[in-house]
């Protein structure tokens, strides 16, 4: 029950997180004009990953897409790539996790298969969340660097007497949405991985064998016994040792010379 709850909650948290990553990627307000020194302005500039916008005091807004690919900063391209990778991984993770949910029965899927799928989706969510956090953090770092560079440039002209009109940009709403969404996706992924441990069936280090009465004596072939872990060469349930013991998979039992004493 706790496993199902953990898995379900992990799925929901990841779903919200990925929706947030998509929203953040599409949002225009990744960087917004800093109004600290000039709170009353005729226009307000803000920029996203895909276009930049200008809003007038009337409320009228005009946005322009970045129609160039080669002319854009490498960092912006990197952020775009990270966010898209995050979305793609998250979407695949969601698809996998739907089939992995314990509360959903699909054919005769075993718990071990569901456990593997839960782990896979969990890892995908973790990587997706990390991609989003990394993308947003790279953009934020770029903003901070440019902010302080433009601040320094403001007071260098004419011995610090002339202040050039330069638009400085600060953190936009999309950054906070991205950070939170990335964190949620990451948490959801961790929860899925935790749920996977509860879903995985306990593995035994022996094969079940059935015994039948053989005779007065049982002849063992020397060196015939091999321990089976299920991972070695003995994966097809071959006879582990000769004599009276037979594996359950063997339908026919062949007579030995001791059976007719």
């Amino acid at each position: 029950m706790a496993v199902t709850a953990c898995q379900g909650l992990g799925f929901v948290v990841s779903l919200i997180g990925i929706a947030g990553i998509i929203a953040a990627t599409c949002m225009d307000q990744w960087s917004t004009q800093d109004l600290y020194n000039n709170p009353v302005t005729a226009v307000f500039n803000y920029q996203g990953l895909w276009r930049s916008c200008v809003r007038e005091s009337s409320g009228f807004t005009e946005c322009r897409g970045y129609f160039t690919l080669l002319g854009l900063p490498a960092m912006l391209q990197a952020v775009r790539a990270l966010m898209i990778v995050g979305i793609v991984l998250g979407a695949i993770g969601l698809l996998v996790s739907i089939f992995a949910l314990k509360c959903i029965r699909i054919g005769s899927m075993e718990d071990s298969a569901k456990a593997n799928m839960t782990l896979t989706s969990g890892i995908m969510f973790i990587v997706s969340g990390l991609c989003a956090i990394a993308g947003v953090s790279v953009f934020a770092n770029m903003l901070v660097t440019n902010f302080w560079m433009s601040t320094a440039n403001m007071y260098t002209g004419m011995g610090g007497m002339v202040q050039t009109v330069q638009t400085r940009y600060t953190f936009g709403a999309a950054l906070f949405v991205g950070w939170v969404a990335g964190g949620l996706t990451l948490i959801g992924g961790v929860m899925m991985c935790i749920a996977c441990r509860g879903l995985a069936p306990e593995e035994t280090n022996y094969k079940a064998v059935s015994y039948h009465a053989s005779g007065h004596s049982v002849a063992y072939k020397p060196g015939g016994f091999k321990a089976s872990t299920g991972f070695g060469s003995n994966t097809k349930n071959k006879k582990i040792y000769d004599g009276g013991a037979r594996t359950e998979d063997e339908v026919q039992s062949y007579p030995s010379k001791h059976d007719y004493v």
Partner: nanobody, 118 residues
Framework: QVQLDESGGGSVQAGGSLRLSCAAS?????MGWFRQAPGKLRERVAN????????WLADSVKGRFTISRDNAKNAVYLQMTRLRPEDTAMYYC??????????????WGQGTQVTVSS
Amino acid sequence: QVQLDESGGGSVQAGGSLRLSCAASRSTYCMGWFRQAPGKLRERVANVYMRNGDTWLADSVKGRFTISRDNAKNAVYLQMTRLRPEDTAMYYCAAGRSSCLEASISYWGQGTQVTVSS
């Protein structure tokens, strides 16, 4: 250079209607209307992007004014209904070559007066 010819202004009673027209001598990226009342700053009323027909209306005129375009005539029309005394102003037609932002407006009309009496 683009010439803008405005028409349709006049005096009307409160609650009445007027239709302003503006024709450009050649095609532009965006066309719209601004107004300026005596002693006040110029304000944007409405605009339309000529290529895709996207429109914008100021909150103060939403539900009362509509803007439309005619690409064949390079013209825009501002249909004003339920006029109020505060709509009294000089209405200017504006056109932009590459942007609709006020700072980027390339061409301005001479203006047409609209007077709404109570």
